[in-house]
């Protein structure tokens, strides 16, 4: 469960992927498109809104009764708008929606090599935001063997 | 309860080697990255060194880069430092540190052990 | 690398006061930065995390401020058992790196 309705820092941050493309975001038709591409040297990268919340592991998994705390990330590139996890599809997917947010919207937030970050899915553990052939997807992982693949880890940049 | 114990410190000589344990308890150690923070007597904390939960990525602070190595053995619920080259400027206590969050580290430092005490000195 | 000044270095306060310290960062951080408080003898604990989320255990008097460069921590009315020596700590991106440290005394 998320502890508490409010995030506990929010930040605005372009995302780029680890190979320096950038996530960007286009109104088509009265929806937006999420793209990853090389930008031009002068054009201003996106910003996305970063809100963090703090959730609870159930004991069970982290085995520290109520010490096990995750982070969450929301993350929104304009106004009432969220990137969510479409598992069905395999898809991330930018929707409008009203608080509270729907627990698609939510991603356990992973540190990574290199200063870099990676985006869980809270509704499908071992499913990550990644690339995959230039627009973005949900990537199953094998925690095991791939958790450093570079096409799940992404740079934040202020 | 968490619990951090530290071993392995002692005087040794300029140039000489060390190797600190931290034996945790209480929590799953995999599920966390873990720090070494050393502390010089009478001064500031310095962050040392930290290792992701699997091992798999390590960093280190410039002043012990290519002197120092981290490690850990999930299966032991230890973690491991181990202090080469040492110069006396590396006196310290030594505490290992445990992170707020499982899968990041942006929290700080939420568990820490006792220390234990390396001196180098002649 | 991402260098951390605490200032003052530090302060003498009575019993009530108002106490600020200011951490700020060579570049920016967000929000990523912790407070610790050492006591002589002890080892420090987490005060502060995320720049302003309090850690349990700690009371309401101690908080917290700032994103970007600039952070803050208060003692809105300085306690017998608050006289410690406080640390921030950027945790944004390696090297992690700390502030040299404030000592809070009695006047």
């Known amino acids: 469960s998320i502890t508490g309705i409010s995030p506990i820092t929010e930040s605005l941050a372009s995302l780029s992927t680890y190979n320096d493309q950038s996530i960007t975001f286009a109104l088509e038709d009265e929806s937006y498109e999420i793209y990853v591409e090389d930008l031009k040297k002068d054009k201003k990268k996106d910003k996305v809104l970063l809100s963090y919340y703090e959730s609870q592991h159930p004991s069970s998994e982290s085995g520290d009764g109520v010490d096990g705390k995750m982070l969450m990330v929301t993350l929104s590139p304009t106004k009432d708008f969220w990137l969510q996890a479409n598992n069905k599809e395999h898809s991330v997917e930018l929707h409008k929606c009203e608080k509270p947010l729907p627990d698609q919207a939510f991603f356990v937030l992973h540190n990574r090599s290199f200063n870099c970050v990676s985006f869980e899915c809270k509704t499908d553990p071992g499913v990550f935001i990644g690339v995959k052939d230039n627009h973005l997807a949900l990537i199953k992982v094998d925690y095991s063997e791939n958790l450093g693949s570079e096409n799940i880890l992404f740079k934040l940049s202020e | 309860e968490v619990q951090l114990v530290e071993s392995g410190g002692g005087l040794v000589q300029p140039g000489g080697s060390l190797r600190l344990s931290c034996a945790a308890s209480?929590?799953?150690?995999?599920?966390?990255?873990m720090s070494w923070v050393r502390q010089a007597p009478g001064k500031g904390l310095e962050w040392v060194s930290a290792?992701?939960?699997?091992?798999?990525?390590?960093y280190y602070a410039d002043s012990v880069k290519g002197r120092f190595t981290i490690s850990r053995d999930n299966s032991k619920n230890s973690l491991y430092l181990q202090l080469n080259s040492l110069r006396a400027e590396d006196t310290a206590v030594y505490y290992c540190?445990?992170?707020?969050?499982?899968?990041?580290?942006?929290?700080?430092?939420?568990?820490w052990g006792q220390g234990t005490l390396v001196t180098v000195s002649s | 690398d991402i260098q951390m000044t605490q200032s003052p270095s530090s302060v003498s306060a009575s019993i009530g006061d108002r106490v600020t310290i200011t951490c700020r960062a060579s570049?920016?951080?967000s929000s990523w930065l912790a407070w610790y408080q050492q006591k002589p003898g002890k080892v420090p604990k987490l005060l502060i995390y995320a720049a302003s989320s309090l850690q349990s255990g700690f009371p309401s008097r101690f908080s917290g401020s700032g994103s970007g460069t600039d952070f803050t921590l208060t003692i809105s009315s300085l306690q017998p058992e608050d006289f410690a020596t406080y640390y921030c700590q950027q945790t944004h991106s390696f090297p992690w790196t700390v502030g040299q440290g404030t000592k809070v005394e009695i006047k």
């Open positions: 209480g929590f799953t150690l995999s599920s966390y990255a």
């Open positions: 540190a445990k992170t707020l969050y499982t899968t990041s580290w942006y929290g700080g430092f939420q568990h």
């Open positions: 290792i992701s939960g699997s091992g798999g990525s390590t």
């Open positions: 570049q920016g951080i």
